[in-house]
Amino acid sequence: QLPPGKPEIFKCRSPNKETFTCWWRPGTDGGLPTNYSLTYHREGETLMHECPDYITGGPNSCHFGKQYTSMWRTYIMMVNATNQMGSSFSDELYVDVTYIVQPDPPLELAVEVKQPEDRKPYLWIKWSPPTLIDLKTGWFTLLYEIRLKPEKAAEWEIHFAGQQTEFKILSLHPGQKYLVQVRCKPDHGYWSAWSPATFIQIPSDFTMND
């Protein structure tokens, strides 16, 4: 029977800069029941606080709700593992909420075949930013990526859309059914999951000629 091994805070994520969650990996348990607690202080403070919510994020997690989240303050946190034989601490982790955003997928993905008389036909793709993201403040810049493929194909074709919320694709195989998805990320945060796929049938008379 031994003291617990060193835990590690391995991931922190925020959907929108207003709440965030961190997860840790337990070290070895030393063969004894082990209790874990996450403590933190904010920059400029010496007062230590305990995790406000161990439930919402699932096992080995700490969730910081709106009233505990500030995008202006650095959080300095560590996990303490304790059993009857002793304690061990994770390394301190410095978290700036602005850097750990992983948004929800974009919404309202709409796909349409456009066939103007005087120009090449194209696939028109449009979407909306995730609900929780407030782009009006200027604190957020969301970047978007689109992927599409014929239904039976193995390989996705990927297009980077930058900050725009609509995109045109010209080169498509006539008569094929395509799957289309979109995802987003803040400037230096994490990519969201892909949105649910939208299917579009490309007409057989869709021409790629000039």
Epitope: F10, W72, T74, Y94, V95, D96, T98, Y99, W139
Partner: antibody, heavy 120, light 112 residues
Framework: QVQLKESGPGLVAPSQSLSITCTVS????????VNWFRQPPGRGLEWLGM???????DYNSALKSRLSISKDNSKSQVFLKMNSLQTDDTARYYC??????????????WGQGTLVTVSA | DVLMTQTPLSLPVSLGDQASISCRSS???????????LEWYLQKPGQSPKLLIY???SRFSGVPDRFSGSGSGTDFTLKISRVEAEDLGVYYC?????????FGGGTKLEIK
């Protein structure tokens, strides 16, 4: 504990390219950005560029055309490549880990640096 | 690029004195996320730089409380309340808000 160690060629001929490896331990490169700096003998520090946890990069605009930063997360190594070296590229080159999880600044942990001399 | 100007270039002090180093940026260094990533580093002879202060005024772990940072916008100051022998070296301010990140030219703190 967190450690970074640079390894470089020491001497590089003018117009040749430079490759330096920064080998890290005590943290994962997927969670923390690594920056590169240099310091000519007796002079101040210059930021060269960085690679973020997600693999994206930022560069010093003055050096962007001849600089490349990459990494191998599984080997815990970050690479700096610089082309067309001249004598004024002689400096001690440092790698440093950011303070913030997934962040881009505040360099809490530094390697000891590797001295690169550009000379024929 | 943001130019960081440090004064003085050299600062002779007696042990126990207060020291003050100024750093001015050529433009605002408030990041688009609202934070100001202004940092101070100390480099002792033959060593790598060490982080003292981040985000203008926050002391890094293990940094003695005789070091304090202040300022906003474009004007920033590092103060050492009672200089000790181990504080001697070159101090650099640094902005990490706008790429390319830039250092000040350095201030050498030395014994009078």
């Amino acid at each position: 504990q967190v450690q970074l160690k640079e390894s470089g060629p020491g001497l590089v001929a003018p117009s040749q390219s430079l490759s330096i490896t920064c080998t890290v331990s005590g943290f994962s490169l997927t969670g923390f950005g690594v920056n590169w700096f240099r310091q000519p003998p007796g002079r101040g520090l210059e930021w060269l560029g960085m690679i973020w946890g997600d693999g994206s990069t930022d560069y010093n605009s003055a050096l962007k055309s001849r600089l490349s930063i990459s990494k191998d997360n599984s080997k815990s190594q970050v690479f700096l490549k610089m082309n067309s070296l001249q004598t004024d590229d002689t400096a001690r080159y440092y790698c440093a880990r950011v303070l913030y999880y997934y962040g881009g600044n505040s360099f809490a942990y530094w390697g000891q640096g590797t001295l690169v001399t550009v000379s024929a | 690029d943001v130019l960081m100007t440090q004064t003085p270039l050299s600062l002779p002090v007696s042990l126990g004195d207060q020291a003050s180093i100024s750093c001015r940026s050529s433009q605002s260094i408030v990041h688009s996320n609202g934070n100001t990533y202004l940092e101070w580093y100390l480099q002792k002879p033959g060593q790598s730089p060490k982080l003292l202060i981040y985000k203008v005024s926050s002391r890094f772990s293990g940094v003695p409380d005789r070091f304090s940072g202040s300022g906003s916008g474009t004007d920033f100051t590092l103060k050492i309340s009672r200089v000790e022998a181990e504080d001697l070296g070159v101090y650099y301010c640094f902005q990490g808000s706008h790429v390319p990140y830039t250092f000040g030219g350095g201030t050498k703190l030395e014994i009078k």
